[in-house]
Interface confidence: medium
């Protein structure tokens, strides 16, 4: 896995795909649908939770026309994820074993429709826009989980959540080294997919403890980190620009070399 | 919770046939797909085959089992099946049943319920 050095660990290829618009549908172009599973196990919130887990992580719960508009794009998940409208929903783009789930063998989003509040599930978000900039943070011992917090913190930052990173990959971040996010998870992004980092389409890659894509990284297991400066903020010094963004939209990476 | 109880197993020569039952009780859960999965002396727990429990529910197999196992199910008796044709020695293993909420990979750590188990026996 990118990044991780001898540590065993599990990545997902996570298909993320941009969304453009929809007709009617209240969002901007470029905007991204992305599942979400913010703790260890898999199937865990119920619908108020789900809200809420898009919201900490700087997105909204995905509309069942965001998710069709995604699937039509290409995206495909194996994993059923609450929507707007209080549906279960997910994904299949080419029906297939091992996902156990789809009645018949054509492609389409899924759904079980209206579940009760209280059945727990994943969560499909949506984030459009990114009020600021990713930057990726480095040193040479690399940071436990709390050394990342705090590090962000020092260079007048946050350690950058889940739906900001995926804004700023959808905006053209490109790093094959999995970093600390603020919900403990490890993901890198991906814009052009090569052998070494993780699959062959592009997306945000997320480092799983086990082989069925659950469990968080150890925290105090040293990685890079993800750290997200809001607009208003002024940079530090001792941070270098790490190459010239290939985002048209001028998401900054910034290295910091600074031990 | 979802109670599974397995049976049907026992001994039979090679390229002979058993039919394994697992009966599901507890609530009715319409979002539960249905498998069995095996697991031979000194091995780890593998993926046999796997029913949706929908109307005209999808199946799934793996590739060891694939023209020779047969996974159906009985809605109105909440009751999985495994006819299981052609065996051989290698099929030798504790047979589980599982259940588990959909969509769900193959991995046995998704299924969230287990059965005890019965054991089948390959061997002339």
């Known amino acids: 896995t990118p990044g991780l050095g001898p540590a065993t660990a599990f990545t997902s290829e996570d298909l993320v795909v941009q969304v453009t618009a929809v007709p009617g549908q209240p969002h901007l172009p470029g905007g991204v649908v992305f599942h979400y599973r913010p703790g260890p196990t898999r199937y865990s919130l119920t619908f108020e939770e789900a809200q809420q887990a898009c919201l900490r992580t700087g997105a909204v719960i995905a509309s069942p026309e965001q998710l069709q508009a995604a699937y039509e794009a290409g995206y495909e998940q194996c994993d059923a994820g609450w929507l707007r409208d209080q549906t279960v929903r997910y994904p299949i783009v080419s029906p297939r074993t091992p996902c156990v789930g789809d009645k018949d063998s054509s492609p389409g989003v899924r759904t079980y429709g209206v579940r009760p509040s209280t059945e727990t599930y994943d969560v499909y978000c949506f984030v459009d826009r990114l009020e600021g900039e990713v930057f990726f943070a480095t040193r040479l011992e690399q940071f436990t989980f709390q050394e990342a917090l705090e590090f962000c913190e020092s260079h007048n930052a946050t350690l950058a959540t889940t739906g900001q990173l995926y804004a700023a990959w959808s905006r053209g971040l490109d790093k094959c080294y999995a970093g600390w996010l603020a919900d403990g998870s490890l993901r890198y992004p991906i814009v052009t997919p090569r052998p070494a980092c993780g699959g062959d389409k592009p997306g945000v890659r997320t480092v799983y403890l086990y082989p069925n894509q659950t469990g968080l990284p150890d925290p105090l297991s040293r990685h890079h980190a993800f750290c997200f400066r809001g607009i208003s903020a002024v940079p530090s010094p001792g941070e270098e620009e790490g190459g010239t963004p290939t985002s048209p939209s001028g998401v900054e990476e910034w290295i910091v070399t600074q031990v | 919770d979802v109670q599974l109880v397995e049976s049907g197993g026992g001994l039979v020569q090679p390229g002979g046939s058993l039919r394994l039952s697992c009966a599901a009780s507890?609530?009715?859960?319409?979002?539960?797909?249905m498998g069995w999965f095996r697991q031979a002396p000194g091995k780890e727990r593998e993926f046999v085959a796997a029913?949706?429990?929908?109307?005209?529910?999808?199946?799934y197999y793996a590739d060891s089992v694939k023209g020779r196992f047969t996974i159906s199910r009985d809605n109105s008796k909440n009751t999985v099946y495994l006819q299981m044709n052609s065996l051989r020695p290698e099929d030798t293993a504790v047979y589980y049943c599982?259940?588990?909420?959909?969509?769900?990979?193959?991995?046995?750590?998704?299924?969230?319920?287990w059965g005890q188990g019965t054991l089948v026996t390959v061997s002339s």
């Open positions: 599982a259940a588990a909420r959909i969509p769900v990979r193959t991995y046995t750590s998704e299924w969230n319920y």
């Open positions: 029913i949706t429990w929908s109307s005209g529910g999808r199946t």
């Open positions: 507890g609530p009715t859960f319409s979002r539960y797909a």
